[in-house]
Amino acid sequence: EPPTACREKQYLINSQCCSLCQPGQKLVSDCTEFTETECLPCGESEFLDTWNRETHCHQHKYCDPNLGLRVQQKGTSETDTICTCEEGWHCTSEACESCVLHRSCSPGFGVKQIATGVSDTICEPCPVGFFSNVSSAFEKCHPWTSCETKDLVVQQAGTNKTDVVCGPQDRLR
């Protein structure tokens, strides 16, 4: 009696269980009563990542440099290419189909978390006692200069965008 189900890594065709093609190979012809399944390796820049009965391999993903992408891990006959973003850019989606430039933190704000290939820069306002006078994707808020440790006095108060200005102490005669 013809089978109604087949073992793992097999498929049912013409009332017969045929072996699936291994990852990295595509189906050329189904098995018969007298012959095994015929499979062929995927061509260059192609892959199949599962045991399959596909007649065509998939093309490796193209990491388009015009979209800010680069190859992180090159594909093989069994795996697809993995794209990531060039430095200074991050993915716009989980699938990482394109990238956008990392955001910079404006003066008065510092970097709380540096951007990665998949997440943007996180900025935070500089709290009292700290400042940032640049627009940057890397710079944290810097602490105001401590005039006292230099034996100086504050001549101009700091802000979230400027450092304090220190000056000499008035000497009483």
């Epitope: 820049s45 680069r70 190859v71």
Partner: antibody
Framework: QSVEESGGRLVTPGTPLTLTCTVS????????MTWVRQAPGKGLEWLGI?????STYYASWAKGRFTISKTSTTVDLKITSPTTEDTATYFC?????????????WGRGTLVTVSS | AVLTQTPSSVEAAVGGTVSISCQSS????????LAWYQQKPGQPPKLLIY???TLASGVPSRFKGSGSGAQFTLTISDVQCDDAATYYC???????????FGGGTEVVVK
């Protein structure tokens, strides 16, 4: 961000030698790393590559003569049994040398001299 | 794969134009995995062109890469004294083990 090669020195033929490429400012889990060499007065020669998951690929003539491995911040090139033909400056390069990325980083190279 | 670079040496006058050819024995990955490098004595190679035709950061627009598949050209127009160097093409392929460099072209500026 930088890559820096070290370990180059004068060795006698047959004495194994390991060169180390130390990286800083980026992660080896995000970049493939390539080894290239250049004999004095000669052209550039591609030796092999270690990708982000640690798979290694070698030039056909280099298989068995070189071994590439890595840790979290270093990439090693072992010359298994050096001959005088292996006298060269060895370069460590971030990324696939022919890829569509413009952010490749080359080290300054380390000189290996094989002589008896 | 074999990358054949021609000529092996070329002389150029200041202000002139130089073309270097790079022929691959098989198509490079995605038809554009071809880079051009410039090397001066005692220095590591410097990336000029990647993706067959994209100019690397800081490289003058006098350098131009063209081609696709297995045939590529580097053209240097308005040649300057500073362009005296050896130029290499480098190809990446579907199989990493095929990766390689061309034999190099020495550009001598008169």
């Amino acid at each position: 961000q930088s890559v820096e090669e070290s370990g180059g020195r004068l060795v006698t033929p047959g004495t194994p030698l390991t060169l180390t490429c130390t990286v800083s400012g980026f992660s080896l889990s995000s970049y493939a790393m390539t080894w290239v060499r250049q004999a004095p007065g000669k052209g550039l020669e591609w030796l092999g590559i270690i990708d982000t998951i640690g798979s290694t690929y070698y030039a056909s003539w280099a298989k068995g003569r070189f071994t590439i491995s890595k840790t979290s911040t270093t990439v090693d090139l072992k010359i298994t049994s050096p001959t005088t033909e292996d006298t060269a400056t060895y370069f460590c390069v971030r990324d696939y040398i022919g890829s569509t990325s413009g952010k490749k980083l080359w080290g300054r190279g380390t000189l290996v001299t094989v002589s008896s | 794969a074999v990358l054949t670079q021609t000529p092996s040496s070329v002389e150029a006058a200041v202000g002139g134009t130089v073309s270097i050819s790079c022929q691959s024995s098989k198509s490079v990955y995605y038809k554009n995995w071809l880079a051009w490098y410039q090397q001066k004595p005692g220095q590591p190679p410097k990336l000029l062109i990647y993706g067959a035709s994209t100019l690397a950061s800081g490289v003058p627009s006098r350098f131009k890469g063209s081609g696709s598949g297995a045939q590529f050209t580097l053209t240097i127009s308005d040649v300057q004294c500073d362009d005296a160097a050896t130029y290499y093409c480098a190809g990446g392929y579907s199989s990493d083990s095929d990766t390689g460099f061309g034999g190099g072209t020495e550009v001598v500026v008169k």
